[in-house]
């Protein structure tokens, strides 16, 4: 069966800037700003467009070791991103894939709304585990807020037509120091 879960969440970050950081450069940004949630993102095949396969690895202590995502659509004009979780994590005997749609919509106050749709494609009559839906939502929220905190702390980042560089994330300006990681992410 197919089980659809839709959520909306707001952000103070303008839609174009959030799309650049959260969607287009998430692979680079997530392990830097949320290492407690994602340890690495590896491009298996493709150049970021439809058909691209990515392997997202999780740090020790989380329920799953990795997932593989397939990019289905990247719409730069409408700030829309569709992808599917096709391997690893919860995918297995009872779950075939999870199709995800993220649309970032500008709001009149200069912020944005993220409209998220998660379709769980189960095998046969199997239902979706509530814990899985909750964990997935929490992961998304963690990543979004970590990216927001970075963008609020670095006024220039992703404001122009450039993605963040290693240099921008390094030195005194990196968001999370080793000391901070020790204090805040390994309690």
């Amino acid at each position: 069966g197919v089980f659809n879960y839709e959520t909306e969440t707001t952000s103070v970050i303008p839609a174009a800037r959030l799309f650049k950081a959260f969607i287009l450069d998430g692979d680079n940004l997530f392990p830097k700003v949320a290492p407690q949630a994602i340890s690495s993102v590896e491009n298996i095949e493709g150049n970021g467009g439809p058909g691209t396969i990515k392997k997202i690895s999780f740090p020790e202590g989380l329920p799953f070791k990795y997932v593989k995502d397939r990019v289905d659509e990247v719409d730069h004009t409408n700030f829309k991103y569709n992808y599917a979780v096709i391997e690893g994590g919860p995918i297995g005997d009872t779950l075939e894939k999870i199709s995800n749609e993220i649309k970032i919509v500008a709001t009149p106050d200069g912020g944005s709304i993220l409209k998220i749709s998660n379709k769980y494609h189960t095998k046969g009559d199997h239902e979706v585990k509530a814990e899985q839906v909750k964990a997935s939502k929490e992961m998304g929220e963690t990543l979004l807020r970590a990216v927001e905190s970075y963008l609020l702390a670095h006024s220039d980042a992703y404001n122009e037509q450039k993605l963040i560089s290693e240099e921008d994330l390094g030195g005194e300006q990196k968001l999370i120091s080793e000391e901070d990681l020790h204090h805040h992410h390994h309690h």
């Epitope: 609020l152 702390a153 006024s155």
Partner: antibody, heavy 118, light 107 residues
Framework: QLQLQESGPGLVRPSETLSLTCTVS??????????WGWIRQPPGKGLEWIGS???????YYNPSLKSRVTISADTSKDQFSLKLRSVTAADTAVYYC??????????WGQGTTVTVSS | DIQMTQSPSSVSASVGDRVTITCRAS??????LVWYQQKPGKVPKLLIY???SLQSGVPLRFSGSGSGTDFTLTISSLQPEDFATYYC?????????FGQGTRLEIK
Amino acid sequence: QLQLQESGPGLVRPSETLSLTCTVSGGSISSSNYWWGWIRQPPGKGLEWIGSIYYSGITYYNPSLKSRVTISADTSKDQFSLKLRSVTAADTAVYYCAKLEWLRLDFWGQGTTVTVSS
Amino acid sequence: DIQMTQSPSSVSASVGDRVTITCRASQGISSWLVWYQQKPGKVPKLLIYAASSLQSGVPLRFSGSGSGTDFTLTISSLQPEDFATYYCQQAKSFPLTFGQGTRLEIK
């Protein structure tokens, strides 16, 4: 209306730890829209940023104070706190807590005077 | 770190005068500059953000300009309540840094 209020001892002995708390009312420190911070001003001198915290616990500190500073947050109480270790007379100042919107300090507490003296 | 330098450190002026205070950043900060006013024994008050945007409630005689490394705060016609110390602050990224302040005194 958002209000911030600093609290803590007004006198700290040299080499001890200065501890201050900022209580936020009329708003929530759990908002993902803002950072929160501590700033100080020694008598007759300018403003010095000490450090800032995001509701998730991520922190930034002034490099010159980093080895002595810890800022933490208690979202359940809408409070964030400052600890400054191994204080000397040079740490005597008015200490302010503030809300940061896009890195501008748009709401400040009234400030609390901390004197370091034996 | 980005260093902020204000000039002059103090200035004497009379009511009705036009006063300009400058602030220089040690590296480009685009328009990420903030100005504050502080009166003796009082809390700093946000005047201008993003180099030229007036904070709500701030009188129109205050204006800001500049981009990159050089910025100015202008008071077009000084009022008695404007005598205070003014600070600039870069809002590009942490660590936040302030200018040393400019004290505006009555001549």
